[in-house]
């Protein structure tokens, strides 16, 4: 029977009594930055090239000693579950290691730099095809160590790391922070996340997805053919780097954002407890568990869409929050939300020739997260429609009045304190799909989008009576890249997209009252590309 | 996952114009920051990276880093060059006391400057 | 699924020796530590003895320490436990079991992570009388 | 040597009775603690792991609680497959002891 983990992220389709995928990434190779490995373990022997760089501390304490199966042991357990013969993901994946943690498994941030331009510069030296650098090893927030990472990544390096093991938000950890690396949380055989002693897996909005990260049965240092279960989310990084592998051997040409993306598309959506996370929490962290794509072709067609949301801007009445997408992605729309329900609202706004997504919080209110949705649109025309505050009964309203353009996301903003208390709520005149409406006292903006192909639909579900949550959610074959609420009322806590889903929250129902005032609509607009689709018929 | 995290220290050293009379002074309003871990244990005092501006060439930064060690040895402290980082970001990985910080801000290019500190197996 | 079958006992005198053994299916056998658990006629459960993965560690309950032997063959995916100087109560069932467990880093170092003897064999029976 | 003490040696309950079995160590073991379910001719079967963490393919009505020297398992609500002998095992620097089991048998 093949390991719990490699059944967790294997497809039903190529599920077999042995997990043989088919191309297991024999066109990438994976950095390693770890400890040292045992490179002649059967499991990697003959895939795993250990290079000639070690920035390694001295270990602690007087009494510590040098035994060779104890410094492998971490280094010799990831290469083996991300290429191992018996227990890998990517049993095809080339593997290179760099030795940057201690017998101890410490290492230092100049070190990791170090290793990391190490990497770049043998890239510029000898260019290979796509690689990926799994990072299984955390700091504090390091500036330097993200920055370092975003460069590489822009570079054309997929970068993936462990969220870290501390029980704790991952956006305090490097390189755990930086957002242009994929970081992993660890979940268990019951799609549980990890506990690790008194510890256990991080998450937060920092965490890109989960992964298989306690039990692993991989490599042991302890002998050639020894196996040993390890737990940790440096496993998880190694299972998504595996897949990564996997992925881009069958499609080389995908960019860092373009496999973000499917790894997102294909994970297992809404598996995890989220009781185990805290409450605070709960709503930033995604609930996604990595798997391979059912099929290694064809998902091109799609349009791929994911949620970012921001740091937190923080009680003051001026703050403000801002989310941002890759450079490769377009921002469909912008959303807002805040635990209080004092905001001002969203706008999406131009910052360095792109668009971002700006919150505003409210005074009195304890702050607001900013929610972008990041789409891949190619040949995408993107532009910003707004509408000052109307004065006038029927509230305010923009539409996307270019010739082709399609509205993909509605946002509003107000800079009254209280939106609309004792007004009536404004409701959408029914056969207008491509326009925005909101309260009169708040300026609308309508991000409106050009692409070839690309058409958008609005749904809505509204509930009469007040609820702590109204969801709306596109129908199979359309992606959700708006996501509102119908009114822009105080009650409403704020909206955000989970997965293809619009979730729009309120305030406790207890606290609210039920007036017509609990009226609350979800608004999503949901759009696909014919244009994808056509592409990749063609393709096949 | 932002660069504006806040919960990391960051420590912003004020220049002022000293004794030095550097040839190449920062640029008017821009203020290099010095950066460390929040969490205390893992710190390294006394290695730091500093970090250059943007298209800073190799060759500066290897004059920037002599210029430090030279206006250190003046100080009568000891440096030490460990690395000079090009490829990725331009800087070096110097070896000195604390107390030579707001010195270092004040070279020409750099961006900021953040001190070592632990990484461990996840 | 992950079986374990034990074979190896039977009557022995006082004094004597028998060998047990344990036959484990795939390499999740030789992941963990395995341990070898007994129970005499109508009694509870005793533990034995257990060993690491690569046989470098082997430990044993006080009552049989010098007279047993726990060992294991990993390109065989067996365990064994050899039992000399064999004592009336030795009479028991025993059982082999699949220590789970799982290392994790933190603190400059592994620690283990204990779940218990999660697959047990179905029993051999050691009989000793003369 | 860690002793483990199960009480009560003998337990008499009805289907749909909540059911109680507690297990102390003669000292702390963290919750480095196992709870095993037996039938009469059959090998023992994990019910709880680390004190309170469920095994998995083990019914919800079983829970475990406890940390230190005091464990406690506790079936919620008894069902006819429940009754059997059930035992406690410490886990202490790779060497176990379990306690001398409980007979949990039909009133």
């Known amino acids: 029977s093949i390991p719990w983990n490699l059944e967790r992220i294997t497809p039903p389709r190529y599920r077999a009594d042995e997990y043989q995928p088919p191309d297991g990434g024999s066109l990438v190779e994976v950095y390693l930055l770890d400890t040292s490995i045992q490179s002649d373990h059967r499991e990697i022997e003959g895939r795993v090239m250990v290079t000639d760089f070690e920035n390694v501390p001295e270990e602690d304490g007087t009494r510590f000693h040098r035994q060779a199966s104890k410094c492998d042991s971490h280094g010799t357990h990831l290469a083996g579950v991300v290429s191992g013969r018996d227990a890998g993901v990517a049993k095809g994946a080339s593997m290179r290691s760099l030795r940057v943690l201690n017998c101890q498994g410490k290492g230092t941030v100049s070190g990791t730099l170090i290793g990391l331009e190490f990497i770049r510069k043998s890239q510029l030296v000898q260019p290979v095809g796509p690689l990926v650098v799994l990072l299984p090893l955390a700091g504090g927030y390091s500036r330097v160590l993200n920055a370092a990472c975003q460069r590489l990544a822009r570079a054309g390096v997929v970068l993936v790391t462990a969220a870290g093991n501390f029980r704790d938000d991952a956006c305090l950890y490097s390189p755990a922070s930086a957002p242009e690396v994929i970081t992993v949380g660890a979940t268990n055989a019951q799609d549980q996340p990890v506990t690790l002693g008194t510890l256990g897996t991080n998450f937060g909005r920092c965490v890109d997805l989960f992964a298989p990260g306690e039990d692993i049965i991989g490599a042991s240092s302890d002998c050639s053919t020894c196996f040993v279960s390890q737990s940790g989310t440096s496993q998880a990084a190694a299972h998504v780097a595996g897949i990564a592998a996997m992925m881009l051997s069958a499609e080389p040409e995908l960019t860092l954002a373009e496999l973000r993306q499917r790894l997102i598309h294909f994970s297992a959506k809404d598996v995890i407890n989220e009781a185990w996370f805290p409450e605070d929490q709960r709503v930033l962290t995604p609930n996604l568990v990595a798997a391979l794509p059912p099929s290694t072709h064809g998902a091109g067609w799609q349009l791929f869409c994911r949620t970012v949301w921001s740091a937190h801007s923080g009680p003051t009445r001026m703050a403000t929050a801002v989310a941002r997408c890759a450079p490769d992605e377009e921002l469909l729309s912008c959303s807002s939300f805040s635990r209080s329900g004092k905001r001002r609202g969203e706008r999406m706004e131009a910052q360095g020739g792109k668009l971002v997504c700006r919150a505003h919080n409210a005074f009195g209110g304890e702050g607001v997260y900013a929610i972008a949705r990041c789409c891949l649109l190619p040949q995408a025309n993107c532009s910003v429609h707004t509408a000052p505050p109307a004065e006038a009964s029927m509230g305010t309203r923009v539409h996307c009045h270019q010739q082709g353009h399609v509205l993909t996301g509605c946002s509003s903003h107000w800079e009254v304190e209280d939106l609309g208390t004792h007004k009536p709520p404004v409701l959408r005149p029914r056969g207008q799909p491509n326009q925005c409406v909101g309260h009169r006292e708040a300026s609308i903006h309508a991000s409106c989008c050009h692409a070839p192909g690309l058409e958008c639909k609005v749904k809505e579900h509204g509930i009469p009576a007040p609820q702590e949550q109204v969801t709306v959610a596109c129908e199979e074959g359309w992606t959700l890249t708006g996501c509102s609420a119908l009114p822009g009322t105080s009650h409403v806590l704020g909206a955000y997209a989970v997965d293809n889903t619009c979730v729009v929250r309120s305030r406790d129902v207890s606290t609210t009252g039920s007036t017509s005032e609990g009226a609350v609509t979800a608004v999503a607009i949901c759009c696909r590309s014919r244009h994808l689709a056509q592409a990749s018929q063609e393709l096949q | 996952q932002e660069d504006e995290d806040g919960d990391y220290e960051e420590l912003v050293l004020a220049l002022r114009s000293e004794e030095d009379g550097l040839a190449e002074a920062p640029e008017h309003g821009t203020t290099a920051t010095f950066h460390r871990c929040a969490k205390d244990p893992w710190r390294l005092p006394g290695t730091y990276v500093v970090v250059l501006k943007e298209e800073t060439h190799l060759s500066q930064s290897e004059r920037t880093a002599r210029r430090l060690q030279a206006q250190a040895a003046r100080r009568g402290y000891l440096t030490k060059i460990l690395h000079v980082f090009h490829g990725l970001l331009p800087g070096f990985l110097v070896k000195m006391s604390g107390d030579l910080l707001e010195l270092a801000l004040k070279l020409p290019h750099v961006d900021y400057i953040e001190e070592d500190s632990s990484v461990f197996a996840q | 699924e992950v079986q374990l079958v034990e074979s190896g006992g039977g009557l022995v005198q006082p004094g004597g020796s028998l060998r047990l053994s344990c036959a484990a299916s795939?390499?999740?056998?030789?992941?963990?530590?395995m341990s070898w658990v007994r129970q005499a006629p109508g009694k509870g459960l005793e533990w034995v003895a257990n060993?690491?993965?690569?046989?470098?560690?082997?430990y044993y309950v006080d009552s049989v320490k010098g007279r047993f032997t726990i060992s294991r063959d990993i390109a065989k995916n067996s365990l064994y436990l050899q039992m000399n100087s064999l004592r009336a109560e030795d009479t028991a069932v025993y059982y082999c079991?699949?220590?789970?467990?799982?290392?994790?880093?933190?603190?400059?170092?592994?620690?283990?992570?204990?779940?218990?003897?999660?697959?047990w064999g179905q029993g051999t029976t050691v009989t000793v009388s003369s | 040597d860690i002793q483990m003490t199960q009480s009560p040696s003998t337990l008499s309950a009805s289907v749909g009775d909540r059911v109680t079995i507690t297990c102390r160590a003669s000292q702390s073991i963290s919750s480095w603690l196992a709870w095993y379910q037996q039938k009469p001719g059959k090998a023992p079967k994990l019910l709880i792991y680390k004190a309170s963490s469920l095994e998995s393919g083990v019914p919800s009505r079983f829970s475990g609680s406890g940390s230190g020297t005091e464990f406690t398992l506790t079936i919620s609500s008894l069902q006819p497959d429940d009754f059997a002998t059930y035992y406690c095992q410490q886990y202490n620097s790779y060497s176990y002891t379990f306690g001398q089991g409980t007979k949990l048998e039909i009133k």
């Open positions: 060993i690491k993965q690569d046989g470098s560690e082997k």
């Open positions: 079991a699949r220590d789970r467990g799982t290392y994790y880093y933190a603190d400059g170092g592994y620690n283990y992570y204990y779940y218990g003897m999660d697959v």
């Open positions: 795939g390499i999740t056998f030789s992941s963990y530590w």
